[in-house]
């Protein structure tokens, strides 16, 4: 991969600070889940957002950490162990499993920086991979051979 | 949302440069799609990664931009218009549609920075939202009312 040159911000601009400020804006899914009028249930709706029309329906759970960038992440949580029948959208079909799709997302944690003599010099960013569940997917169960 | 203090890197450390270097490492899905021995097809496998066992199977397409962070993004591409039958794993079931799940991801583009008199001062980062398709999901078609 190419290596970018060092970023040279214009006068008075702290690029790291800009990154921090930009990244604190949460980015929910394009089609956000509306609050259910009924309790969350194992059924596939015929309207509404993708996560409620899916035959492997899921809800989103907010994961907020003020010491992390992004501060807000959303984790998918499956509402059914199996898939919902395409015939009715209501009962479960155990021929399919509802499985979480995971992704390792790059996040940054703030940690104290130390100067030459170990003095506290503000905060630095530490990059980590963070496992996020993106969605629930209806899959055929694995055949153990 | 809380506002973090300005990042104070230790001597000789350019935090923006660090962010750039860290972010150029692509982060594929946890369970990467192995190259198929057979041509990509509209069927749900009983083994292999999640995207090939799904009844809304998909492949990943690399989107590389050396002027963007992250440089490598992966887009899901559905292999079937409908869902695959849970009974056989090969026939399509028109009662379900295979739909892309989208997400607006924060990315950073490098652009030239300009000094006080408009002189070129290296590169700055510009934050943008970038639409990425994460997966294909089997859904019940919308009922038009």
């Amino acid at each position: 991969y190419s290596h970018w040159p060092s970023c040279c911000p214009s006068k008075g601009q702290d690029t790291s600070e800009e990154l921090l400020r930009w990244s604190t804006v949460p980015v929910p899914p394009l089609e956000p889940a509306r609050p259910n009028r009924h309790p969350e249930s194992c059924r596939a709706s015929e309207d509404g957002p993708l996560n409620s029309r899916a035959i492997s329906p899921w809800r989103y759970e907010l994961d907020r950490d003020l010491n992390r960038l992004p501060q807000d992440l959303y984790h998918a949580r499956c509402l059914c162990p199996h898939c919902v029948s395409l015939q009715t959208g209501s009962h479960m079909d155990p021929r399919g499993n509802s499985e979480l799709l995971y992704h390792n997302q790059t996040v940054f944690y703030r940690r104290p920086c130390h100067g030459e003599k170990g003095t506290h010099k503000g905060y630095c960013l530490e990059r980590r991979l963070y496992r996020v569940s993106l969605a629930c997917v209806c899959v055929r169960p694995r055949v153990m051979g | 949302y809380s506002h973090w203090p300005s990042c104070c890197p230790s001597k000789g450390q350019d935090t923006s440069e660090e962010l750039l270097r860290w972010s150029t490492v692509p982060v594929p899905p946890l369970e990467p799609a192995r190259p198929n021995r057979h041509p990509e097809s509209c069927r749900a496998s009983e083994d292999g990664p999640l995207n090939s066992r799904a009844i809304s199977p998909w492949r990943y397409e690399l989107d590389r931009d050396l002027n963007r962070l992250p440089q490598d993004l992966y887009h899901a591409r559905c292999l079937c218009p409908h869902c695959v039958s849970l009974q056989t794993g090969s026939h399509m079931d028109p009662r379900g549609n295979s739909e892309l799940l989208y997400h607006n991801q924060t990315v950073f583009y490098r652009r030239p920075c300009h000094g006080e008199k408009g002189t070129h001062k290296g590169y700055c980062l510009e934050r943008r939202l970038y639409r990425v398709s994460l997966a294909c999901v089997c859904v019940r078609p919308r009922v038009m009312g």
């Epitope: 029948s85 009715t88 | 039958s85 009974q87 028109p94 009662r95």
Partner: antibody, heavy 123, light 113 residues
Framework: QLQLQESGPGLVRPSETLSLTCSVS??????????WGWIRQPPGKGLEWIGN???????FYNPSLKGRVTISVDTSKNQFSLKLSSVTATDTAVYYC???????????????WGQGTLVTVSS | DIVMTQSPDSLVLSLGERATFNCKSS????????????LAWYQQKPGQPPKLLIY???TRESGVPDRFSGSGSGTDFSLTISSLQAEDVALYYC?????????FGQGTKVEIK
């Protein structure tokens, strides 16, 4: 053999709630091989499916009835019930209860049917 | 929703004649994974509830006389009475159970000349 019998008031006022019960005899409502349904037939017209219930309480309804329908089950009495709210004259019909087969994780045909009960919506 | 359309609306025939009526669905009710057509036929005599005659488009329910037969696949189906009897005077409905909501045709009325 299994029999179904509908019961409830024959006259309901507009805007009120229609309530009917279906009693199942010579068979258990707790069978895992069946769903239980309601179908109606306006005078001189065709059949319209209203909704279904499983003994565990899982329900699904005809979207055309716009959330006015509630079906419940009482396994101790071997009965299931229909409630249709905010009725109008267009809800006047013979209401049938029926058993619907359930096998290979799919629902199929209705058999048998109850005799039906005429419900008139009028003030 | 799947729309079921029956034709003709009524049929007036003599005893012993062959009666054929049709049912068309707005989309296929054939499941290619099991090669089954999710269609049933019912008979409704005056003042009585509907009675199941045929399921899976062509399988006769036990106790139904063999003069009744069903055929067709995909979107086009028919019910045939090979030799019309007086007790066959009734309304005949087709119904799909491929996808909820379950829907019925408007019915075909069979009468004797």
């Amino acid at each position: 053999q299994l029999q179904l019998q509908e019961s409830g008031p024959g006259l309901v006022r507009p805007s009120e709630t229609l309530s009917l019960t279906c009693s199942v005899s010579s068979g258990s409502i707790r069978s895992s091989n069946y769903y239980w349904g309601w179908i109606r037939q306006p005078p001189g017209k065709g059949l319209e499916w209203i909704g279904n219930i499983y003994y565990s309480g899982n329900t699904f309804y005809n979207p055309s009835l716009k959330g006015r329908v509630t079906i419940s089950v009482d396994t101790s009495k071997n009965q299931f019930s229909l409630k249709l709210s905010s009725v109008t004259a267009t809800d006047t019909a013979v209401y049938y209860c029926a058993r619907q087969g359930y096998s290979d994780y799919e629902l199929n045909w209705f058999d048998p049917w109850g005799q039906g009960t005429l419900v008139t919506v009028s003030s | 929703d799947i729309v079921m359309t029956q034709s003709p609306d009524s049929l007036v025939l003599s005893l012993g004649e062959r009666a054929t009526f049709n049912c068309k669905s707005s989309q296929s009710v054939l499941d290619s994974s099991n090669n089954k057509n999710y269609l049933a036929w019912y008979q409704q005599k005056p003042g009585q509830p509907p009675k199941l005659l045929i399921y899976w488009a062509s399988t006769r329910e036990s106790g139904v006389p063999d003069r009744f037969s069903g055929s067709g696949s995909g979107t086009d189906f028919s019910l045939t009475i090979s030799s019309l009897q007086a007790e066959d005077v009734a309304l005949y409905y087709c119904q799909q159970f491929y996808n909820s909501p379950w829907t019925f045709g408007q019915g075909t009325k069979v009468e004797i000349k």
